[in-house]
Interface confidence: medium
């Protein structure tokens, strides 16, 4: 039996700049029941606070609701492990919420096969920003990528679309079924996971409808 091993805060993420969660790896428990507490201070403040919510985001996590989240302050976060033989503290993590944004994927992905006047067909891909992001006010500037592949292909073909929420894909093979996904990234954050997969078959004999 021994004091607990040093815990490690391994991830902090915010979906929207309004809330965030940090998760930690406990380290060894020294063979004894071990309690973990996350404490934080904010830059320029003397006070130290304990995690406001250990439950919402699951085991070994701390959730900071709107009430506890500020993008104007740096959070200095540590996790403390304690058992009856002693205690151990993680290295501090300096968290600027604006840097840890990982949004939900774009929504309402729609796929449509269209035809130009010269009979050339293309796939028109459209989507909407994730629900929680306030793109219109400039609070978020969102960039997007789409990826597609035919059912038979091993590799995805990725297209960066900038701030556009639509994209036209040319040179697709008739008779093939294509899978499409989108993802997004805020100005200073990280790419969302790829969104729900949609599929569409490119017709062999596409005729333009009125």
């Amino acid at each position: 039996q021994s004091p607990p091993g040093k815990p490690e805060i391994h991830k902090c993420r915010s979906p929207d700049k309004e809330t965030f969660t940090c998760w930690w790896n406990p380290g060894s428990d020294g063979g004894l029941p071990t309690n973990y507490s996350l404490t934080y201070s904010k830059e320029g403040e003397k006070n130290t606070y304990e995690c406001p919510d250990y439950k919402t985001s699951g085991p070994n996590s701390c959730f900071f609701s709107k009430q506890y989240t500020s993008i104007w302050k740096i959070y200095i976060i540590t996790v403390n492990a304690t058992n009856e033989m002693g205690s151990s503290t993680s290295d501090p993590l300096y968290v600027d919420v604006t840097y840890i944004v990982e949004p939900e994927p774009p929504r309402n992905l729609t796929l449509e096969v269209k035809q130009l006047k010269d009979k050339k067909t293309y796939l028109w891909v459209k989507w909407l920003p994730p629900t929680i992001t306030d793109v219109k006010t400039g609070w978020f500037t969102m960039e997007y990528e789409i990826r597609l592949k035919s059912e038979e292909a091993d590799e995805w073909e990725i297209h960066f679309t900038g701030h556009q929420t639509q994209f036209k894909v040319f040179d697709l093979y008739p008779g093939q079924k294509y899978l499409v996904q989108t993802r997004c990234k805020p100005d200073h954050g990280y790419w969302s996971r790829w969104g729900q997969e949609k599929s569409i078959e490119i017709p062999n004999d596409f005729t333009l409808k009125d």
């Epitope: 993008i71 740096i74 600027d96 604006t98 990280y190």
Partner: antibody, heavy 120, light 112 residues
Framework: QVQLQQSGPGLVAPSQSLSITCTVS????????VNWVRQPPGKGLEWLGI???????NYNSALMSRLSISKDNSKSQVFLKMNSLQTDDTAMYYC??????????????WGQGTLVTVSA | DIVMTQTPLSLPVSLGDQASISCRSS???????????LEWYLQKPGQSPKLLIY???NRFSGVPDRFSGSGSGTDFTLKISRVEAEDLGVYYC?????????FGGGTKLELK
């Protein structure tokens, strides 16, 4: 504890390229950005560029065409490559880790520096 | 690119004096997220630079409280309340708000 260890050649011939490796310990490259900064002898500091936790890069616009920053997360190594060196590229080259988790500036931890002399 | 201008170039002091270094940016360095990423570094001869202050006024861990930063918009100041021998060296301001990030030219704090 956090450490950044640099290795690279001390002497580079004009028009040749430079490669410096920054090997880090005490933190993961998937959680912190690493910057490169240089300092010509007797002069001030110049920011060269950054590779972020997610692998995205930003460069000093004046050097962008000659500069490339990459990394190998599994080996905890960050690489600086610079092409077409001239005598005015003679400098001490530093790698430096960001203070903020997933952040960029605030160079809290620095390598020891690699002195690069460009000379025939 | 944003130009960071430091004054004075050289600052002769006596130990125990108060020292003040000014840094002015050629345009506002308020980031699009509302924060101001203005930093101060100290470099002693033959050493790598060290972070003193981040986000205008926040001391990095281990930095003595005789160091303080202030300012907003385009005008920023680093103050040392009572200069000690270990404070001598070259001080650099730095903006990390707008790429390409830029350093000031440096201010040498030296004994009179």
């Amino acid at each position: 504890q956090v450490q950044l260890q640099q290795s690279g050649p001390g002497l580079v011939a004009p028009s040749q390229s430079l490669s410096i490796t920054c090997t880090v310990s005490g933190f993961s490259l998937t959680s912190y950005g690493v910057n490169w900064v240089r300092q010509p002898p007797g002069k001030g500091l110049e920011w060269l560029g950054i590779i972020g936790a997610g692998g995205s890069t930003n460069y000093n616009s004046a050097l962008m065409s000659r500069l490339s920053i990459s990394k190998d997360n599994s080996k905890s190594q960050v690489f600086l490559k610079m092409n077409s060196l001239q005598t005015d590229d003679t400098a001490m080259y530093y790698c430096a880790r960001s203070l903020y988790y997933y952040g960029s500036s605030s160079f809290a931890y620095w390598g020891q520096g690699t002195l690069v002399t460009v000379s025939a | 690119d944003i130009v960071m201008t430091q004054t004075p170039l050289s600052l002769p002091v006596s130990l125990g004096d108060q020292a003040s270094i000014s840094c002015r940016s050629s345009q506002s360095i308020v980031h699009s997220n509302g924060n101001t990423y203005l930093e101060w570094y100290l470099q002693k001869p033959g050493q790598s630079p060290k972070l003193l202050i981040y986000k205008v006024s926040n001391r990095f861990s281990g930095v003595p409280d005789r160091f303080s930063g202030s300012g907003s918009g385009t005008d920023f100041t680093l103050k040392i309340s009572r200069v000690e021998a270990e404070d001598l060296g070259v001080y650099y301001c730095f903006q990390g708000s707008h790429v390409p990030w830029t350093f000031g030219g440096g201010t040498k704090l030296e004994l009179k």
